[in-house]
Amino acid sequence: GSQHIRAEKAMVDGSWLDLAKRSKLEAQPFAHLTINATDIPSGSHKVSLSSWYHDRGWAKISNMTFSNGKLIVNQDGFYYLYANICFRHHETSGDLATEYLQLMVYVTKTSIKIPSSHTLMKGGSTKYWSGNSEFHFYSINVGGFFKLRSGEEISIEVSNPSLLDPDQDATYFGAFKVRDID
Amino acid sequence: GSQHIRAEKAMVDGSWLDLAKRSKLEAQPFAHLTINATDIPSGSHKVSLSSWYHDRGWAKISNMTFSNGKLIVNQDGFYYLYANICFRHHETSGDLATEYLQLMVYVTKTSIKIPSSHTLMKGGSTKYWSGNSEFHFYSINVGGFFKLRSGEEISIEVSNPSLLDPDQDATYFGAFKVRDID
Amino acid sequence: GSQHIRAEKAMVDGSWLDLAKRSKLEAQPFAHLTINATDIPSGSHKVSLSSWYHDRGWAKISNMTFSNGKLIVNQDGFYYLYANICFRHHETSGDLATEYLQLMVYVTKTSIKIPSSHTLMKGGSTKYWSGNSEFHFYSINVGGFFKLRSGEEISIEVSNPSLLDPDQDATYFGAFKVRDID
């Protein structure tokens, strides 16, 4: 009888350990990716940024994948997504082609099943960066809560990529899972 | 036998209560600190802001410590950190020393073990606040997901602190723990 | 005896299932509301935005209620609140009444019990949108961690509502519950 009770208890322990593992101990996905400025496009138009660090300095990733410039969702869920994009110009970098700039970021979601891209969040500003000042700076922050499915991809598009601040504290984006889909 | 079964059940209950306490019911750390404007430094250079409220109005703290102007981590984990910093100037406050301003925020992490400070996030803008307008305003928001260890300290640095908006809804920073470190 | 043991086990299972449901499986409240631009007030003064989508595109809501232009809390807790507000103007829309603008957002909390409204977060900028440029754009992002009680209401106020960008990726606000109140 005592042996049977212990078996019952083990079942209880085991099933609950499974539940606990799934509900809490199973690592919730996250990513914080910082700009890799060694390969920034040259144009002033809107471009997708494909070079990001995922494993140095503040950059990190867990239970998500970074591939071909995109953050890939491995686990269905509701995620908080965010991006911080800094632009800067110093007169030593040369003369700007135009002093009227559109400094923008677009956080996009792509579904492989339905090969289409949709903008989840956008932010930015038009700026007049006159030659009267030797230094100019501007940062954008966006964030929001989105349902993401396994296999979906998050990417970042910006205008005027050659003006990006290459510091890891300046230009980054990320995500963390907040809860499951019901 | 029945007594033995109850003891077994109590063990199951007890161990799971411990697990539940650790995994869910143990309060997850957080803080939302609002500016204490009674002690804002003057000058236009970059300074660390040391005066924040932690227990009035919207300000609150739990399982973190506020000491010497720094938010101290008591529990290892991955945290979402954020800051909202508002700058403003009204002509009744007097003439600005310069109309070309760098309005910036830096969210920094200091480790006591290795006495060094690192910037986790930065944001802001250069602004031209001309005398043609009687009122000027600008806000910065930054946020990101970071691994923090017990004993590490988070602090806020800004440029032009004398231009800070002293309202609790304007100038604040905070953190909340999202998940454990694996 | 064996039947009694099973009953004990069922009690253990049942109580833990309750705990698990409450602690994890009970859906944590959230909302992501996107601007409904069919009913945006005119004028340049501060107005409350009452028209938001909650069930189309990126907009969604769970365990919270949207009513009369306000996001109503149904479950006590600590929530992360956020808003992203975009303003834009193209010369084809006509001349601005003034080139000096205050583009602001206020995230407010109203308690029905104590009929008063308080600003939780604010952000924005004064802007000079001159006629030299055919297009102007500016975005604001704010976010913070707040204790909300069941029945409290969150609303969004902005200045210059007629300049709002009506895209769902541009102008939105939201909330998600992070943890219980101790």
Epitope: G43, H45, G94, T98, N160, S162 | - | -
Partner: antibody
């Protein structure tokens, strides 16, 4: 592939006008400044004019200022050079060229067309 | 306007030679200098920008150096495909000018 194709050249009498076009493909035309450069027979290269990616800023060599106008239509991926009051010394092969950097001046011209010949006589 | 003076005007060399072409600006242009190669009947081709940055796809035997008023283009080991005319081009304050060219011919 990235390509620029000039057209509109020909023989014209002094004092008359001509409009050159440059059709761009293979890159985001609206993201880059564009130049016109010319080369007289058996001579070196001479810069003529430049236009920023958004059309807001344009600059000209002294030799053509007031006579030539550079413009673009980003919807058609096309650059133009309107040449008025043409002179014999304007005889040359005219090249359009793309700025290497869209944001900054000064980085050089990384894509060139094959050129179109203008003869003023 | 800033004048650009290239030297020599003509250079005779053999395959495998190390070749250096100089370009002088009439006033400082910082590092805002580019080098181009042009073959008869063809459009110019960008080799070097910002004085020393090698354009994508250009062989590494080409290199640029200098700043201020004095700049050089070096071909470390001349190849048969390198016989052409080379131009420097400066940028300064919304004005662009080319040097008169250096013709590299077979000795």
């Amino acid at each position: 592939q990235v390509q620029l194709v000039e057209s509109g050249g020909g023989v014209v009498q002094p004092g008359r006008s001509l409009r050159l076009s440059c059709a761009a493909s293979g890159f985001t035309f609206s993201g880059y400044g564009m130049h016109w450069v010319r080369q007289a027979p058996d001579k070196g290269l001479e810069w003529v004019a430049v236009l920023s990616y958004d059309g807001t800023n344009k600059y000209y060599a002294d030799s053509v200022k007031g006579r030539f106008t550079i413009s673009r239509d980003n919807s058609k991926n096309t650059l133009y050079l309107q040449m008025n009051s043409l002179r014999a010394e304007d005889t040359a092969v005219y090249y359009c060229a793309k700025c290497l950097s869209g944001t900054y001046w000064g980085y050089g011209m990384d894509v060139w067309g094959q050129g179109t010949t203008v003869t003023v006589s | 306007d800033i004048q650009m003076t290239q030297s020599p005007s003509t250079l005779s060399a053999s395959v495998g030679d190390r070749v250096t072409i100089t370009c002088r600006a009439s006033q400082s242009i910082s590092s805002w200098l580019a080098w181009y190669q042009q073959k008869p009947g063809k459009a110019p081709k960008l080799l070097i920008y910002k004085a020393s940055s090698l354009e994508s796809g250009v062989p590494s035997r080409f290199s640029g150096s200098g700043s201020g008023t004095e700049f050089t283009l070096t071909i470390s080991s001349l190849q048969p495909d390198d016989f052409a005319t080379y131009y420097c081009q400066q940028y300064n304050s919304y004005s662009w000018t080319f040097g008169q060219g250096t013709k590299v011919e077979i000795k």
